[in-house]
Interface confidence: medium
Amino acid sequence: MAVTACQGLGFVVSLIGIAGIIAATCMDQWSTQDLYNNPVTAVFNYQGLWRSCVRESSGFTECRGYFTLLGLPAMLQAVRALMIVGIVLGAIGLLVSIFALKCIRIGSMEDSAKANMTLTSGIMFIVSGLCAIAGVSVFANMLVTNFWMSTANMYTGMGGMVQTVQTRYTFGAALFVGWVAGGLTLIGGVMMCIACRGLAPEETNYKAVSYHASGHSVAYKPGGFKASTGFGSNTKNKKIYDGGARTEDEVQSYPSKHDYV
């Protein structure tokens, strides 16, 4: 039950996170005009990954797309790439995790396959979240650098009569959305990985080991009697795993996943 809850919650958290990453990527407010200690202008500038906008005092907004690809800063291209990779990985992770959900039955899919898919989607969510966090952080770093550069220019370039007040940009709403969304996707991924451990079948069956006594040709299967008499774990639909020989006591001390059902 706990495994199902962890897996389901991981899926939902990741879903919200990926929706947030998509929203952040599409948002225009990655950087917004810094209004603090600046002359009050009749227009407000803000920029996204794909276009820049100008909002007039009347509320009328005009946006222009970045129609050039080669003319854009390499950092902006890198941020775009990171966000897109994050979205793609997250989307694939979501698709995989849907089939991995314990509450969804697809044919005779074995629990081990579900466990593998849960782990795969978890890793994908983790990488997706990291990509989003990295992308947003790179952009934020770029803003901080440009902010202080333009601040220095504002105070050094005032020798003449004419002042050219540079438009300084600060963190926009999309950065915070991106950080939170990336964090949620990361948390969701970790939860999926944790759920995977609970989903993985316990190694209660072992490969047959032949013991040849002189003059006899008898194969002895350790634990075989226990499995067949129904005292141990239910072996239905379970693969026989290679594992180190364990004593009867050791086997009993590890509860199987079916003890939680």
Partner: antibody
């Protein structure tokens, strides 16, 4: 068509307050901003302040403490209130409509204000 | 506040002549966001309210004759009338339409010889 009409007291005594109304037609105050501008006799134009469609206001920094701009969207009226009037406040007072893109595209005919005892 | 300086304060011309007046601002009126210069030119004839001629420094308002041309960027702007007509005699004002408070230039008076 777009029209703006200013109406004021005409004559005000020094240190008194002024209230001028700008009644607009042909457009909605919820869509466009309105600015107030004055012009002393034989002199240039001086911007007083603006009230935008969303209600945000900006004022001339030299007159900020004496000025107040408000509006009544339902009556299509914009009000200019100014206190502690002096003789140098004698001027023609205009209200003008801002386009979406902010420039002043339509002006009223103006109302004359004389500050005299 | 942004100071708008217009020159000359008055111009005496003959009909058909080309005339250029200047407007300088103490701060750049160029918005980096859309690369537009927020400077507007107005014409005021005696006894009338001002009328818009040019916005964004160079965009002619609809209905304005094409003999009126605005140019310039940043802090230096100019208004050119290619062939002055009698009806062009008026006072021309430039307006900083970018920084609050909005500020007008002192005006350039265009007179006939």
């Amino acid at each position: 068509q777009v029209q703006l009409k200013e109406s004021g007291p005409g004559l005000v005594a020094p240190s008194q307050s002024l209230s001028i109304t700008c009644t607009v037609s042909g457009f909605s105050l919820t869509d466009y901003g309105v600015s107030w501008i004055r012009q002393p006799p034989g002199k240039g134009l001086e911007w007083l302040g603006v009230i935008w469609n969303r209600g945000n206001t900006y004022y001339n920094s030299a007159l900020k403490s004496r000025l107040s701009i408000s509006k009544d969207n339902s009556k299509s009226q914009v009000f200019l209130r100014m206190n502690s009037l002096q003789t140098d406040d004698t001027a023609m007072y205009y209200c003008a409509k801002h386009d979406f893109l902010r420039f002043l595209d339509y002006w009223g005919q103006g109302t004359t204000l004389t500050v005299s005892s | 506040d942004v100071v708008m300086t217009q020159s000359p304060s008055s111009l005496t011309v003959t009909a058909g002549e080309k005339v250029t007046m200047s407007c300088k601002s103490s701060q750049s009126l160029l918005n980096s966001g859309n690369q537009k210069n927020y400077l507007t030119w107005y014409q005021q004839k005696p006894g009338q309210p001002p009328k818009i001629l040019i916005y964004w420094a160079s965009t002619r308002e609809s209905g304005v004759p094409d003999r009126f041309t605005g140019s310039g960027s940043g802090t230096d702007f100019s208004l050119t009338i290619t062939s002055v007509q009698a009806e062009d005699l008026a006072v021309y004002y430039c307006l900083n339409d970018y920084y609050y408070p909005l500020t007008f230039g002192a005006g350039t008076k265009l007179e006939l010889k």
